[in-house]
């Protein structure tokens, strides 16, 4: 009788065992194992038993003892059950992001592993169990579908493989695929709200506002604005579900014509985008030009304004004959002229808006000096020891300068509070003079003395 | 029947080699281990070298590595044991023995002394 | 390196006395032990192989037991051909080691 030693064995991949074979005679003409593994034989004395090495065991296998024996040719098997944990355990590749409401296939490919009869496999969100299955085939391939929810976000999805050898008294195996973390999203179908100038001055800075609501996870938005190939850099802030993207834009001559304006939102693998055409203009204010800006009285001035081609302008309130971008008006100066205003503006007509601009100028009109009874009297009585003010006011442009003298030498202290003296009585030659020109006036003055009773 | 025979053993100085045979009779060595163990005079066992004849395959003691060949001829059925730079420590009986894990069958063995 | 300690290093009995040698494996070796007997001037023989597997031609009076760790050769009635040195040794990793032997005296 053959027997062999252990009758079952269960072992690693690649790994060796011992098997013995014996027989129950004492003297047997042959004992052996039959086995296509590299074998050696542990040597022992005597005739009835012999241990062999089977290594590098790739596969089951079932080595079998025989003996020949007086009594007649026996066999014994030893089954050699090989185990080993999957080669590969992997999720099938999925977009990170997902849209909420979007049924989500996981599908786990399993290659390898042994015993397959101890081998399951199982889909995990985090550590629940969606689904397990024995693992057939090869691949093994084990699906199950998830319905995207919200709290789904930033979940990890993996695959296990469970290798229970515990009823063989081993251990249980376990092999886990790389993590799929799930991005859930939703981004709402309406597109973005833009606000922005309709139109923008060449050289001047406006204003961009993009925002939308309804988003998830909002943090995680992108938000892009650009005006033609211009990038903005907006700052954005954050609500609970929605965001406001404000940036600053600024235009130059390079810009002018009609631009797009887009703001794109890109959340997850979709985007919405809104659209805006913003028109860029060059509108510099009219030109108000003076024949001189400084003229003497009597002078003839020219008064133009000149604008953008396409505007239309009106001076000083009256609009151009024919209606355009020219004006002029022609006057006389007079000293009423001096510091006068002249005023054009301008009206442009941008994408269906009116742009209007201004520019003044002011006239001087050289007059003078003057002086006259009114601002300068011919004659003055004041009564001894009172006190006066000498009032005498030139006129002209510039302002001339005013001197009165007594006998050219004795100054008649003009704005000034004095006493009355008989030294003040007499006719003083008041000379008004600037780069206009000199005029003289003679103002006299009586002292009265009191009457002594 | 199974039988080893050492030989080659004697006295060397320090610094000295000396290449013992292990010639088996009664069964093939290509089908099993041979190892080589020693024991210094008085003392216990100690474990020395492996070769698996069939694929060459050798493992050794740290005490011996790098100075220690072991090596086999399967036409002579034969196993050596190249000694190297010798020591005085490896003063000991060289036993050629067989088997796998245990050692079921022993040489009578070989001295070697190193001395000078 | 598993160190293996032998105890008693040394003891001294009667003929038809039980003897037991307990061998101690610094880290668990399974039953990867064996147990040799030494008379001097010759070489080592094997007795038990895998803690408890005996040898043919081997007298069943020496029997050995344990696993993991611990390990037990047993004489069960001490003849007088089995006064010598008697040696357990690993065969769980390399390299092979021997205990430092447990020598059996004649009281």
């Known amino acids: 009788q053959t027997s062999v030693s252990p009758s079952k064995v269960i072992l690693p991949r690649g790994g060796s065992v011992l098997v013995t074979c014996s027989t129950s005679c004492d003297q047997p003409k042959l004992l052996g194992i039959e086995t296509p593994l590299p074998k050696k034989e542990l040597l022992l004395p005597g005739n009835n038993r012999k241990v062999y090495e089977l290594s590098n065991v790739q596969e089951d296998s079932q080595p079998m003892c025989y003996s020949n024996c007086p009594d007649g040719q026996s066999t014994a098997k030893t089954f050699l059950t090989v185990y080993w944990t999957p080669e590969r355990v992997e999720l099938a590749p999925l977009p990170s992001w997902q849209p909420v409401g979007k049924n989500l296939t996981l599908r786990c490919q399993v290659e390898g592993g042994a015993p397959r009869a101890n081998l399951t496999v199982v889909l995990l969100r985090g550590e629940k169990e969606l689904k397990r299955e024995p693992a057939v085939g090869e691949p093994a391939e084990v699906t199950t579908t998830v319905l995207v929810r919200r709290d789904h976000h930033g979940a990890n999805f993996s695959c296990r493989t469970e290798l229970d050898l515990r009823p063989q008294g081993l251990e249980l195996f376990e092999n886990t695929s790389a993590p799929y973390q799930l991005q859930t999203f939703v981004l709402p179908a309406t597109p973005p709200q833009l606000v922005s100038p309709r139109v923008l001055e060449v050289d001047t800075q406006g204003t961009v506002v993009c925002s939308l609501d309804g988003l998830f996870p909002v943090s995680e938005a992108q938000v892009h604005l650009a005006l033609g190939d211009q990038r903005l850099n907006p700052t954005v802030t954050y609500g609970n579900d929605s965001f406001s993207a404000k940036a600053s834009v600024s235009v130059t001559a390079e810009d002018e014509g009609t631009q797009r304006l887009t703001c794109a939102v890109i959340l997850g693998n979709q985007s919405q985008e809104t659209l805006q055409t913003v028109t860029i203009y060059s509108f510099p204010a009219p030109n108000v030009i003076l024949t001189k800006p400084e003229v003497s009285e009597g002078t003839e001035v020219t008064v133009k304004c000149e604008a953008h081609p396409r505007a239309k302008v009106t001076l000083n309130g009256v609009p151009a004959q024919p209606l355009g971008p020219r004006a002029q008006l022609l006057l006389k100066a007079t000293p009423e002229d001096n510091g006068r205003s002249f005023s054009c503006s301008a009206t442009l007509e941008v994408a269906g808006q009116l742009i209007h601009k201004n520019q003044t100028r002011e006239l001087r009109v050289l007059y003078g000096p003057r002086l006259d009874e009114r601002d300068c009297p011919g004659n003055w009585t004041w009564p001894e020891n009172s006190q006066q003010t000498p009032m005498c006011q030139a006129w002209g442009n510039p302002l001339p300068e005013l001197k009165c003298l007594k006998d050219g030498t004795f100054p008649l202290p003009i704005g000034e509070s004095v006493t009355v003296t008989r030294d003040l009585e007499g006719t003083y030659l008041c000379r008004a003079r600037s780069t206009q020109g000199e005029v003289t006036r003679k103002v006299t003055v009586n002292v009265l003395s009191p009457r002594y009773e | 029947e199974v039988q080893l025979v050492e030989s080659g053993g004697g006295l060397v100085q320090p610094g000295g080699s000396l290449r013992l045979s292990c010639a088996a009779s009664?069964?093939?060595?290509?089908?099993?281990?041979i190892h080589w163990v020693r024991q210094a005079p008085g003392k216990g066992l100690e474990w020395v070298a492996r070769i698996d004849p069939a694929n060459d395959n050798t493992i050794y003691a740290d005490s011996v590595k790098g100075r220690f060949t072991i090596s086999s001829d399967d036409s002579k059925n034969t196993a050596y044991l190249q000694m190297n730079s010798l020591r005085a420590e490896d003063t000991a009986v060289y036993y050629c023995?067989?088997?796998?894990?245990?050692?079921?069958?022993w040489g009578q063995g070989t001295l070697v002394t190193v001395s000078s | 390196d598993i160190q293996m300690t032998q105890s008693p290093s040394s003891l001294s009995a009667s003929v038809g006395d039980r003897v037991t040698i307990t061998c101690r494996a610094s880290q668990s070796i399974s039953n990867n032990l064996h147990w040799y007997q030494q008379k001097p001037g010759k070489a080592p023989k094997l007795l038990i192989y895998?803690?408890?597997q005996s040898i043919s031609g081997v007298p069943s009076r020496f029997s050995g037991s344990g696993s993991g760790t611990d390990f037990t050769l047993t004489i069960s009635s001490l003849q007088p051909e089995d006064f010598a040195t008697y040696y357990c040794?690993?065969?769980?990793?390399?390299?092979?080691?021997f205990g430092q032997g447990t020598k059996v005296e004649i009281k």
């Open positions: 023995t067989t088997s796998g894990y245990w050692f079921a069958y």
């Open positions: 009664g069964f093939n060595i290509k089908d099993t281990y």
């Open positions: 040794q690993q065969s769980n990793s390399w390299p092979y080691t």
């Open positions: 895998h803690a408890s």
